[in-house]
């Protein structure tokens, strides 16, 4: 090995990487919220929808004191790819009716894609525990039905929106622990 | 510019300990992973250990769980690499590397012979 | 042997491009982990070239670019120069292990 000598900075540090993941999450928290409007205008919900096949809300308000960066990111990861999985599955799935917001489906994929390597990054960069927490992934099959995907539609943009609306919370508050 | 600098390295006898230590600088140490990674004489990369930014997850490859220990004091910018009961087949060059790994010192040869 | 697997060695000439693959399995690559990719020049300590499968660190030429679909990625430097001559070590998280993962290596040789 040679003498020492300087590595010049990479792009992005840590901080930096969750303020890009912050930024990411709000852009995505708003196309979410725009693309449920555009559902709720073509397809009126007839009340809440669920998916039993969706992850359970993370973060409740009361709990975002007690919050610790690898938890929040681990969990983050993990209902992201959850969504990320039902958004591919709506797209491949979805049937007539929902071929009118493809466009919009298909870019929330992409920016979900690039949340989730944002994130990634940040925990390689921490060096914080990757793997996933074991959970049964449960099988997506065809919706039973014409008005199946649209209330499947409605469910996953319903719990993305929330998981979204806390993960910015959560990485906020983060922040000042980093 | 950011600097890694190992240190501790030398010639120890099969069985024996040593102690490498990584001096870092030009850059939040304490918001960075860091990692020792060795390469054998004209050998590849091998990854050895991680720790969190805070200290709290460590990790180990399997040809080295039990034997090294690895440790960070984020008030002096310091990476520790506590290696016991060495074997010839622990002869390398040791680098200390930072984040993704972003950046690598130049590393510290350590030869373990009789 | 290694986890990720790498051609040992590739070769091409000046202006040449050249790609080298690197290939994992379900627990690295495949569950979606980054793929980075460095050089290490000779005698010199590795060098991050490319991270997040194919962003590259300021400072590195617009030549190098990687890659990544499905359990395998691959490395691209276009217009060969006689100073890429190095090693080439592709990395991923790999779940198996809790750690990252390096390939085996391949050493390209700029000919002529």
């Known amino acids: 090995p040679g003498p020492p000598a300087g590595s010049p900075r990479v792009s992005s540090d840590p901080r930096a990487d969750l303020d890009s993941a912050v930024l990411l999450t709000r852009s995505l928290l708003a196309d979410t919220r725009q693309l449920a409007a555009q559902m709720r205008d073509k397809f009126p919900a007839d009340g809440d929808h669920s998916l039993d096949s969706l992850p359970t809300l993370a973060m409740s308000a009361g709990t975002l004191g007690s919050l610790q960066l690898p938890g929040v990111l681990t969990r983050l990861r993990v209902d992201l790819m959850s969504y990320l999985r039902h958004v591919q599955w709506l797209r491949r799935a979805g049937g007539p009716s929902l071929k009118t917001l493809e466009p919009e489906l298909g870019a929330l994929q992409a920016r979900l894609e690039r949340l989730l390597r944002r994130l990634q990054l940040l925990m390689s960069r921490l060096a914080l525990p990757q793997a996933a927490p074991d959970q049964p992934v449960i099988p997506l099959g065809p919706p039973a039905s014409a008005w199946g995907s649209i209330r499947a539609a409605h469910a996953i943009l319903g719990g993305l929106h929330l998981t979204l609306d806390w993960a910015v919370r959560g990485l906020l508050l983060l922040k000042t622990r980093l | 510019e950011v600097q890694l600098l190992e240190s501790g390295g030398g010639l120890v006898q099969p069985g024996g300990s040593l102690r490498l230590s990584c001096a870092a600088s030009?850059?939040?140490?304490?918001?960075?992973?860091m990692h020792w990674v060795r390469q054998a004489p004209g050998k590849g990369l091998e990854w050895v250990a991680v720790?969190?930014?805070?200290?709290?997850?460590?990790y180990y490859a399997d040809s080295v769980k039990g034997r090294f220990t690895i440790s960070r004091d984020n008030s002096k910018n310091t990476l520790y690499l506590q290696m016991n009961s060495l074997r010839a087949e622990d002869t390398a060059v040791y680098y200390c590397?930072?984040?993704?790994?972003?950046?690598w010192g130049q590393g510290t040869l350590v030869t373990v012979s009789s | 042997q290694s986890v990720l697997t790498q051609p040992p060695s590739a070769s091409g000439t000046p202006g040449q491009r050249v790609t080298i693959s690197c290939s994992g399995s379900?627990?690295?690559?495949?569950?979606?982990?980054?793929v980075h990719w460095y050089q290490q020049l000779p005698g010199t300590a590795p060098k991050l070239l490319i991270y997040?499968?194919?962003e590259r660190p300021s400072g590195v030429p617009d030549r190098f670019s990687g890659s990544k679909s499905g359990t395998s990625a691959s490395l691209a430097i276009s217009g060969l120069r006689s100073e890429d001559e190095a090693d080439y070590y592709c990395?991923?998280?790999?779940?198996?292990?809790?750690?990252?993962?390096f390939g085996g290596g391949t050493k390209l040789t700029v000919l002529g």
């Open positions: 590397a930072a984040g993704v790994p972003d950046y």
């Open positions: 030009g850059f939040t140490f304490s918001s960075y992973g």
């Open positions: 720790i969190s930014y805070d200290g709290s997850y460590k």
């Open positions: 379900s627990s690295n690559i495949g569950s979606g982990y980054d």
């Open positions: 997040s499968n194919n």
């Open positions: 990395a991923a998280w790999d779940d198996s292990l809790s750690g990252p993962v």
